[in-house]
C-alpha cells in the first residue's frame, strides 16, 4: 500500500491530463486493475496496471529517503514543482530531493499511462477474486 499522499494525487491528476488531454483520471485510473488506486496486491492484469504497480513501488522507495520521512507523518505538507508544455512534463530543478523523487514517480507513471492500452473490463475489477498474492 503506497498510501499516495493526497496532494500528490491532485498534482498527479493534472500530470495525467497533461499527457492525456481530455482524460478524467479519477474516473478512469482509480480502481483499475489490481494496483491503480489505493493499495495493491497480486499480479498486474495488464500494462496499465503494471504502470500503477511501478508507481506504488516508486512511492515506497520515496518513503525510504530521509528527506521524505515527513510523508509518513503529514502527507499534506508534500508538494512539488513541475511544468506541462504541450504534452511534455518537466520536473523542476528547484525541487528538493524528496519532491524531485516523487515528481519523477508521477511523471513516469503519467507517461506510462499514455502508452498503455485501456481495457474497460479491468475497471472496478473484483480484486478479491483476481488480485490475490
Amino acid at each position: 500500500d503506497s498510501g499516495i499522499s493526497p496532494r500528490a494525487v491532485w498534482q498527479f491528476r493534472k500530470m495525467i491530463k497533461c499527457v492525456i488531454p481530455g482524460s478524467d483520471p479519477f474516473l478512469e485510473y482509480n480502481n483499475y486493475g489490481c494496483y491503480c488506486g489505493l493499495g495493491g496486491s497480486g499480479t498486474p492484469v495488464d500494462e496499465l496496471d503494471k504502470c500503477c504497480q511501478t508507481h506504488d513501488n516508486c512511492y515506497d522507495q520515496a518513503k525510504k529517503l530521509d528527506s521524505c520521512k515527513f510523508l509518513l507523518d503529514n502527507p499534506y505538507t508534500h508538494t512539488y514543482s513541475y511544468s506541462c508544455s504541450g504534452s511534455a512534463i518537466t520536473c523542476s530543478s528547484k525541487n528538493k530531493e524528496c519532491e524531485a523523487f516523487i515528481c519523477n514517480c508521477d511523471r513516469n507513471a503519467a507517461i506510462c499511462f499514455s502508452k498503455a492500452p485501456y481495457n474497460k473490463a479491468h475497471k472496478n475489477l473484483d480484486t478479491k477474486k483476481y488480485c490475490q498474492s
Epitope: F26, S83, S85
Partner: antibody
Framework: DVQVQESGPGLVKPSQTVSLNCTVT????????YYWSWIRLVSGSKLEWI?????????DINPSLKSRISITRDISKNQFFLHLNSVTAEDTATYYC?????????????WGQGTTLTVSS | DIVLTQSPASLAVSLGQRATISCRAS??????????MHWYQQKPGQPPKLLIY???NLESGIPARFSGSGSRTDFTLTINPVETDDVATYYC?????????FGGGTKLEIK
Amino acid sequence: DVQVQESGPGLVKPSQTVSLNCTVTGHSITDDNYYWSWIRLVSGSKLEWIGYITSSGSTDINPSLKSRISITRDISKNQFFLHLNSVTAEDTATYYCARDSTDGDFYFEKWGQGTTLTVSS
Amino acid sequence: DIVLTQSPASLAVSLGQRATISCRASESVDNYGISFMHWYQQKPGQPPKLLIYRASNLESGIPARFSGSGSRTDFTLTINPVETDDVATYYCQQSSRDLFTFGGGTKLEIK
C-alpha cells in the same frame, strides 16, 4: 496578487456569435499549471461550469455546451476568451472567469466580478 | 454527470443560531479517501467566494463560524453562530469528476 476581469458586449441578438474576454493580471496564464475556467450564473441562482483552458493551452468543455463553445487565449495580452455560437435566451447569464486552486485541486480560488450577457431580440 | 442536490432551497435562521445546509451527490465524490466537495458563498452582485475546500478545510480568511463535514455522498455546511453578514446563497461544488458541477444553491435569510 492575481486578478481576473471579464468583459463582453452586454446585449446581443439570438443566433449571433458572442466572444467574452477575461484579462488576467498579476500572473501569466502560461505558468504554474493553473486551469482558467469560464462559469456562468443562470437565472440568478444556477451555477454552471462551462469549460477551461490550461496553462499549456489545452481545453476541456462541458459536454452539454461543446457543440456551441470554444475557449481560446492570447498569450501576448494574457487574456483568454469564451466564444459562444448561436446564442439563445437561455444563454442570458452572468459569466465569470475563474482560476483553480494553488494546491492543484479543481475548486475555484480566484473569481472575476462577472460580465452580464443578455440575449434578446 | 454528478448531480448535487442541496436542501433546503431556502432557510431563515435567527441571529446567533445554527444554520445547516445539506448537499447530496448522486454518486460518491471520494477518491483515495479524499472528499472532493467544496462550498461557496455568493452575495447579490458579487462572485462566489470559496469557504470550504475538500469537505472540511476552511479557506484562509474565512471565520471559524463556518465548518464543513461529510464524505462520499452526504455533506453539510454549518454556520454557527449565524451573523447578519451571512445572508447569501450557498453552493456546493464537486471536483471528483472532470465535469465539475454545482448544487442548486441554498438561500440563507435572517429570521
